[in-house]
């Protein structure tokens, strides 16, 4: 089965899709008479011919798009100038401006609270079968083993930090060796990447936003896997990161330094901690094989308590048994010895929600999954349509030309490497790349932000959570300094590794076209976002597993056939967009293949029957929920109350190709006005200027 | 307070059996590990065995090993000891005593004694 | 078995004065020793345990020290009720097991 958007009887499509060399927004030629264009007072770019900017995975070359949708919207000002404004006029417009200032601020720390709430979430549900994934023996010789543990774990966790906190106590503790431990952290730097796709999926209301939203976010994850499929192997024949990391651990004399600075927690924690605080030591201990953890809650219920180191007699079969002979004695029954035990006083109660109910963790996961899945998804609405009043007209000219424009020449090359510099720096102040791209998604989707210059940002992410990873290890107690340290190491120099591969050179930026690709087959069919999510961070992993867990046998037996036909469909994709010539006739397109195996179409209509008794039925409840329902059926007309899915589709039911919602629009309620199907509200009374 | 009172003297024959008794009370008597020592005339003192009466174990001196029987009625907070195929080296004053002092073998509490007198 | 050897078997010494009653474990015991004292027909009384901790209502002119196979019972200034005969005991192993014991009289 392919996953691919309709084959038909496509021929190899000899139109070629442009790309700025800087990593500009691909620029369609000549539309300087569209209303939606990005700004043209645009430094001049050179270009480059590249593939098609969907997928290189993609099997087909759909018809050419009238309308580019990677270009930016242009979000018109609706609203009255300043200089035509009145001082009663002008006061009401800043104290506007200062609410949303306020609004935006609160609903982004609500939305970073949430993202710390589904992570805690995810450890609750997953967390006892995540750390039961580490103990598996295997992982030692199998490093696609220890690959698909460390996404695994990571998108149970919905934490690398956690994955790999749990990876540096079992080098430490020489559970692991590091040479183990380096696939793992690869694949935590996976599956850390999904918590931006799931933000991605809260835009699947408008098809052109959640396209951009969903691309910016599954660069990351294109980013992560190509690296990987390209330096696991490398590692595995040269070790050179553990080579690298091991030289350098070896020649500096590391003291203990101080911890990473908390600067994010530092505001978020007062209000998370009051809705769940978890025992993280837990995981980590069933990852060591405590079977005592097993039955331990992850839900914190005391939060001050007394270690008290005493000694107490304790009964022995024999005297062999006791600690020493001079710790040794009789009642004239019994032999007794003297232990050295650690007595914990538990003193005072965490205060929490689910403190006093005493749920099972399943429970409580389950519950604050729901429920900070509802928050970040509210959130995520507010944040959009406050951005989308605000950043309008000259705001946001400024702000994209600031974002994404690139400095002059000779320098424009420089831009994207400032890029991965800011987007490393955020990240180590907000001591998470989650967050960071979890942020950075929402401005991609309302086009504040190309996915050209969201790629350098979460490339930087990436260095930026490894750079944090490294502090935390200079601040390890002394026998996990080493240990930590040089995994901090290897996470970070596998991420230099694959900037170097996928972004210095733009031909060898694949992930942008990776991603768009899959942006345009999601906008279409907003099902296959789900199905996405699912194949590659959980199916492919638990199969890897499945049969690496059979053993090397059976995963050489199934993985080759497999990797073969991807590389021969990849092999003749290429020929069929580059040179059909050669081919033969019947292999220059893909129409020999039934229908199901080269269209989504046929999967389409089952997964529309599947959903069908939604499509009438769910969406009036709220948006939230119609932003559910509309992932789930991609339905034009279940929508009627909330109006949150409607996407101008009546026009354009019969059309194959995505089709972009008319861009000239500023915003959601305007389009709709002029669609007549709000009452136009007075847009007199609009303020755009902060 | 804790009193320990034992049975009156006996004079047996070599061969024969005794079975000598120690009372309590004063304290919860499946509490504490009972002992059993003997005193040889103008001798040391000797180990025979304890047996603890909340549960019935026996602990023995090998030396007395298939000779003496440790038991305890808990209804009557009563400590017996019965020692067969006595021998003229048997004569001595018999002791009980308990242990207050948890998880040691120093005996804080003595009966008055037994003294058991193997004669032909 | 442990054996315990006490030294001296007896000794004679004027009221007021120091006496000094050592004992020798046959194996380390720790610290997993007592003292007892016995006047003439009577039981033997507990004096000391765990080589150094007094029993209640012990003088404190009675102490104890000493570790693993050398165990002292010191009397600081002897009295007239302090004629008997004191034995040391190990409850290290089974079977306990006293010392011979040492007699101590007033000149």
């Known amino acids: 089965m392919a996953p691919w958007p309709e084959l038909g009887d496509a021929q190899p499509n000899p139109d070629k899709y442009l790309e700025g060399a800087a990593g500009q927004q691909p620029t369609a030629p000549d539309k300087s008479k569209e209303t939606n264009k990005t700004d043209n007072t645009e430094a001049p770019v050179t270009k480059i011919e590249l593939l098609p900017s969907y997928s290189t995975a993609t099997l087909i070359d759909e018809p050419t798009e009238v309308d580019d949708p990677w270009n930016l919207p242009t979000l018109q000002d609706s609203g009255i100038k300043w200089s035509e404004r009145d001082t009663k006029g002008k006061i009401l417009c800043f104290f506007q401006g200062i609410g949303r200032l306020i609004l935006l601020l609160g609903f982004l720390y609500f939305f970073v609270c949430s993202l710390d709430i589904l992570s805690s979430a995810f450890q609750l549900v997953g967390g006892k079968m995540a750390g039961q994934f580490f103990s598996n023996s295997s992982i030692m010789s199998n490093p696609l083993l220890g690959l698909v543990i460390g996404v695994l774990v990571t998108v149970l966790v919905q934490s690398s930090s956690t994955s790999t906190s749990i990876v540096v106590s079992m080098v430490s503790s020489s559970l692991l060796t590091v040479r183990a431990a380096i696939p793992i952290i690869m694949g935590a730097n996976i599956g850390t990447s999904i918590t931006n796709t799931i933000v991605a999926l809260m835009q699947v209301g408008d098809r052109s936003e959640f396209r951009r939203a969903f691309a910016g976010a599954t660069v990351h994850d294109f980013f992560n896997w190509l690296s990987v499929l390209v330096l696991l192997p490398v590692e595995v024949a040269t070790h050179y990161l553990e080579i690298i990391t091991q030289l350098i651990v070896e020649s500096f004399h590391f003291k203990n330094g101080e911890d990473a600075p908390d600067l994010l927690k530092v505001i978020t924690k007062p209000f998370t901690k009051l809705i769940v605080q978890l025992d993280k030591k837990v995981i980590s201990q069933i990852a060591m094989n405590d079977e005592k953890a097993k039955n331990k809650s992850l839900v914190k219920i005391w939060c001050k308590t007394f270690t008290n180191k005493t000694q107490i007699n304790v009964t022995v079969p024999s005297t062999a048994n006791c600690t020493s002979p001079s710790l040794c004695w009789t009642d004239g029954i019994q032999n007794w010895t003297m232990k050295n035990v650690t007595y914990k006083e538990n003193i005072a109660k965490c205060q929490h929600i689910f403190v006093n109910f005493h749920l099972p963790d399943l429970a409580v996961g389950t519950i604050l999954l729901i429920l900070s899945l509802l928050v970040l998804c509210g959130c995520l609405i507010m944040i959009v349509k406050i951005l989308g009043s605000v950043l309008k007209g000259q705001v946001a000219t400024v702000i994209k030309k600031t974002i994404n424009t690139d400095f002059p020449f000779p320098f424009a090359w420089l831009t994207g490497y400032l890029a991965i510099l800011v987007g490393a720096g955020m990240t180590f102040i907000v001591q998470s790349s989650s967050v960071f791209t979890s942020a950075l998604t929402p401005l991609i989707g309302i086009g504040v932000i190309t996915i050209e210059r969201a790629y350098p940002l979460t490339l930087g992410s990436n260095i930026g959570t490894t750079t944090t990873a490294i502090l935390a290890a200079l601040a390890s107690p002394g026998n996990a300094l080493r240990s930590s340290l040089q995994i901090a190491l290897c996470h970070f120099f596998f991420n230099i590794s694959g900037i170097l591969l996928w972004y210095p050179i733009p031909f060898t930026r694949l992930p942008i076209r990776m991603a768009k690709g899959l942006g345009n087959i999601s906008a279409k069919y907003r099902w296959f976002a789900v199905f996405y999510l699912i194949i590659f961070f959980f199916l492919i992993p638990l199969t890897v597993f499945g049969l690496s867990l059979a053993g090397w046998r059976v995963l050489v037996g199934v993985g080759v056939p497999v990797v073969f036909i991807i590389i021969l469909v990849l092999c003749l994709r290429l020929l069929q967009s580059r040179c059909p010539r050669v081919l033969p006739k019947k292999l220059q397109n893909w129409n020999f293949l039934p229908l199901w195996m080269r269209s989504l179409k046929p999967w389409d209509a089952v997964v529309s029957k599947f959903t069908g008794c939604f499509q009438m039925r769910c969406c009036c409840c709220c948006r939230v929920c119609c932003r559910a329902c509309c992932l789930l059926c991609d339905c034009p007309k279940c929508c009627r109350c909330s109006k949150c899915c409607e996407d101008l589709e009546e026009a354009q039911e019969g059309q194959d190709v995505p089709v972009k919602a008319p861009e000239t629009f500023d915003n959601i309620t305007i389009s709709r006005e002029a669609q007549g199907e709000v009452p136009a509200s007075d847009s007199k009374t609009e303020c755009t200027a902060l | 307070q804790v009193q320990l009172v034992q049975s009156g003297a006996e004079v047996v024959k070599p061969g024969a059996s005794v079975k000598m008794s120690c009372k309590t009370s004063?304290?919860?008597?499946?509490?504490?590990?009972m002992h059993w020592v003997r005193q040889a005339p103008g001798q040391g003192l000797e180990w025979i065995g304890a047996?603890?009466?909340?549960?019935?174990?026996?602990s023995y001196n090998q030396k007395f090993k298939g000779r003496v029987t440790l038991t305890a009625d808990k209804s009557t907070s009563t400590a017996y000891m019965e020692l067969s195929s006595l021998r003229s080296e048997d004569t001595a004053v018999y002791y009980c005593?308990?242990?207050?002092?948890?998880?040691?073998?120093?005996?804080?509490?003595w009966g008055q004694g037994t003294l058991v007198t193997v004669s032909s | 078995d442990i054996q315990m050897t006490q030294s001296p078997s007896s000794l004679s010494t004027s009221v007021g004065d120091r006496v000094t009653i050592t004992c020798k474990a046959s194996?380390?015991?720790?610290?997993?020793v007592a003292w007892y004292q016995q006047k003439p027909g009577q039981s033997p009384k507990l004096l000391i345990y765990?080589?150094?901790t007094r029993h209640t209502g012990v003088p404190d002119r009675f102490s104890g020290s000493g570790s693993g196979t050398d165990f002292t019972l010191i009397i600081r200034s002897l009295q007239p009720e302090d004629v008997a005969t004191y034995f040391c005991?190990?409850?290290?192993?089974?079977?306990?097991?006293f010392g011979g014991g040492t007699k101590v009289e007033i000149k």
């Open positions: 005593s308990i242990s207050t002092i948890i998880t040691t073998g120093a005996v804080d509490y």
């Open positions: 004063g304290y919860t008597f499946i509490t504490y590990n």
């Open positions: 047996i603890y009466p909340g549960s019935g174990d026996t």
């Open positions: 194996q380390d015991v720790g610290t997993a």
């Open positions: 765990w080589t150094s």
């Open positions: 005991q190990q409850y290290s192993r089974i079977p306990l097991t």
